[in-house]
Interface confidence: low
Amino acid sequence: ASVGLPGDSLHPPKLSTQKDILTILANTTLQITCRGQRDLDWLWPNTPRDSEERVLVTECGDSIFCKTLTVPRVVGNDTGAYKCFYRDTDVSSIVYVYVQDHRSPFIASVSDEHGIVYITENKNKTVVIPCRGSISNLNVSLCARYPEKRFVPDGNRISWDSEKGFTIPSYMISYAGMVFCEAKINDETYQSIMYIVLVVGYRIYDVVLSPPHEIELSAGEKLVLNCTARTELNVGLDFSWQFPSSKHQHKKIVNRDVKSLPGTVAKMFLSTLTIDSVTKSDQGEYTCTAYSGLMTKKNKTFVRVHTKPFIAFGSGMKSLVEATVGSQVRIPVKYLSYPAPDIKWYRNGRPIESNYTMIVGDELTIMEVSERDAGNYTVILTNPISMEKQSHMVSLVVNVPPQIGEKALISPMDSYQYGTMQTLTCTVYANPPLHHIQWYWQLEEACSYRPSQTNPYTCKEWRHVKDFQGGNKIEVTKNQYALIEGKNKTVSTLVIQAAYVSALYKCEAINKAGRGERVISFHVIRGPEITVQPATQPTERESMSLLCTADRNTFENLTWYKLGSQATSVHMGESLTPVCKNLDALWKLNGTVFSNSTNDILIVAFQNASLQDQGNYVCSAQDKKTKKRHCLVKQLVILERMAPMITGNLENQTTTIGETIEVVCPTSGNPTPLITWFKDNETLVEDSGIVLKDGNRNLTIRRVRKEDGGLYTCQACNVLGCARAETLFIIEGVQEKTNLE
């Protein structure tokens, strides 16, 4: 058979035998001559081997490009392919020679010395046991042991070929420890050598590159890439690497097995690629491929080689970040840099350290932003190699959706007396300032009440307060602006001219950051009335009374309750006066009933009021006809006792005779102090020219005379003590003499 490349001008060498297959008997001499167009060489079975001297290759003598191969006393093992070829080419001619030796029909080749057959437990794989024959048409079977089993060619997946050996699906003999071929010639049995069966794995679980993803290096640095393959046991593995640079001299690859951990069912292989000093040409993709004979797995990474360190901010860096109060703020740092920069954050010039509210690093994270977090944040990047720095400032603006101050007051629903004038207010703080505050209303019965929800009132729709038809007459006053707790707040006031209808009022405030609303329950009753005696605001240690007055013809069962702190946890039911539904949960008070011609009056007396007596008091009265309970809530505030204080300055005054002097003594204290005026340490008494008003606070001297000049003292006293302030009145001018004659 001639073998050559298509279109090649070189003709294959010519052999002295015209046949592709030659059959000769053992102990005869094999001689084949080969002629060609250039230098020739011979290859024969089992070359090289110890008995090489048996094979002779000689020049022909009659031609330059001619060689004769001679093998004297051939044996069965000389069976195989004899190849004549042109040196340094693939152009050749081959003849297959069978040496028929009935005493040893199986050929033992060099590679059979070990007699090992490697197989995988793959259903689709076949294995060749290389028991080649010196006779082409033998009846060969395969014996496997232990247990003993014999396989004969079936014309399908099991076959014997004298040139290859015995082919069989590998799983059929995977149980066996050894196999051999057997042939029968003239009732004589011949056996090939024994082959040990080794079951090998092929599965590669994974191939991992370390470092993974992208590796960044400076020119001149050392690159070390580790490729680790995890396989099943009994696997042999080959590694190969693909890399950008064609200059291989500075690359070093070391492959080794890694000791598997005890108890693991995996084997580890490691291939390490090292470049001692990278250059720009080493930049690119590095692929590690692991091959187990049946399976290939690969992984890749990118090696970036920087010729010099650099640093720059990415184009996506923001200069302004707006956030809503309470939200999480993340200000990422986008940079292009090699190596990774040191990142430092500053706020208003001061370095920021990570704590439970702020985390600094590749991004600045503020867990729950508050208004005080607003300001200028500067991030400074430093390249650790070049020490180059870059800075960028981000302004953080914290927006506050409208916050309605009164919303925070958890107080029970107030009831308002029929026909009275009432004022409702919403104090709103928002940043940026409000777009608007709007007031809406709805009839109480048109809304539903679900106390468990954040917004307990659900009204299908809200009507603008301009439309108060069917409701209370309303007037919205012009917004006031006030500095409260250091913040500019907007105060919107709704004046209900006369309380006739039970309703819900809603103030809605909107700004850029969101909206806020407060729903105010306005429950109007014609029922009981609460009064405090005395009418002045009570001070601790004073005696006072709470009076609940109800029409005797309409109401009965007057009872006083105190709404304790436990009432907030009470389930308030569906009513719009939830406090009435939970009287059992309230603290019942003992009162005294008085009656006059039309009313019953239930009095709770406080002989020596204390701050503990403060709170919400509920008067409950039952409608005689309907048996429905009406409840009225009064918030009782007890003022703490305070010694008198003069809260302002008394200025000295200079005036002319006949003018009017006015002076105010500004005082504070609880109980309200008693004010006395002295002139030159003598008590001042009212007369036609001296007038004392507003509880003696205001002193007026009309048509002053020369003798009205002097040192005036204002003295404020209560049970806790006295406070004094002095002022000097200087009267200028000449007193006219009165002619009495």
């Epitope: 777009h435 917004n455 659900t458 809200w462 009507r463 603008h464 301009k466 439309d467 909107i510």
Partner: antibody, heavy 115, light 108 residues
Framework: EVQLLESGGGLVQPGGSLRLSCAAS????????MGWVRQAPGKGLEWVSS????????NYADSVKGRFTISRDNSKNTLYLQMNSLRAEDTAVYYC????????WGQGTLVTVSS | DIQMTQSPGTLSLSPGEGATLSCRAS???????FGWYQQKPGQAPRLLIY???SRATGIPDRFSGSGSGTDFTLTISRLEPEDSAVYYC?????????FGGGTKVEIK
């Protein structure tokens, strides 16, 4: 009786503009949030925009943000929708509706964007 | 943004039967801000249920709404021929306001 009547729809080329109006009667217009909802042929409802009673605050769907402007004239009891840079996908019946709960709707006006 | 998903897409029932329509929100919605609408061919939608369970003015009591959080249901207790329509759910708890894709109710 509450009535909402839309007008201003029609055929317009892509990139063109159109202004829709909604005349309201039978209720106090200035008390209510008003909105526009659209419905492409054979499709479901899609909210477009809402405006507060005073006109001080507005909301838009992302699909129309920057192209459509909602406004109102409380003295004329009229709601408007100015539609610019119209696209084929804006083709729909545009409804005007009252309140957050959209308790009353107009009969709609058809806007066709086609070349 | 909150997505509203309605099921089934179509419901084919006989007069007198009961119908249950479901609406699921991608995140929790306050029931106060949830409604159901009915739209008949060639007509504008009309409000049926507001606040998840309150019937709008003039809506027959065979229509009822329930649910909270992310799952809401519209129940029509005894179907009548005039109930043939597309029913939409809607939320305005968070902007943008959003509708479900609709459930078509056919009367056999």
């Amino acid at each position: 009786e509450v009535q909402l009547l839309e007008s201003g729809g029609g055929l317009v080329q892509p990139g063109g503009s159109l202004r829709l109006s909604c005349a309201a009667s039978g209720f106090t217009f200035s008390w209510y949030v008003m909105g526009w909802v659209r419905q492409a042929p054979g499709k479901g409802l899609e909210w477009v925009s809402s405006i507060y009673p005073s006109g001080g605050a507005t909301n838009y769907a992302d699909s129309v943000k920057g192209r459509f402007t909602i406004s109102r004239d409380n003295s004329k009891n009229t709601l408007y929708l100015q539609m610019n840079s119209l696209r084929a996908e804006d083709t729909a019946v545009y409804y005007c509706a009252r309140g957050n709960y959209l308790d009353y709707w107009g009969q709609g006006t058809l806007v066709t964007v086609s070349s | 943004d909150i997505q509203m998903t309605q099921s089934p897409g179509t419901l084919s029932l006989s007069p007198g039967e009961g119908a249950t329509l479901s609406c699921r929100a991608s995140q929790s919605v306050s029931s106060n801000y949830f409604g159901w609408y009915q739209q008949k061919p060639g007509q504008a939608p009309r409000l049926l249920i507001y606040g998840a369970s309150s019937r709008a003015t003039g809506i027959p009591d065979r229509f009822s709404g329930s649910g909270s959080g992310t799952d809401f249901t519209l129940t029509i207790s005894r179907l009548e021929p005039e109930d043939s329509a597309v029913y939409y759910c809607q939320q305005f708890d968070s902007s943008p306001l959003s509708f479900g894709g609709g459930t078509k109710v056919e009367i056999k």
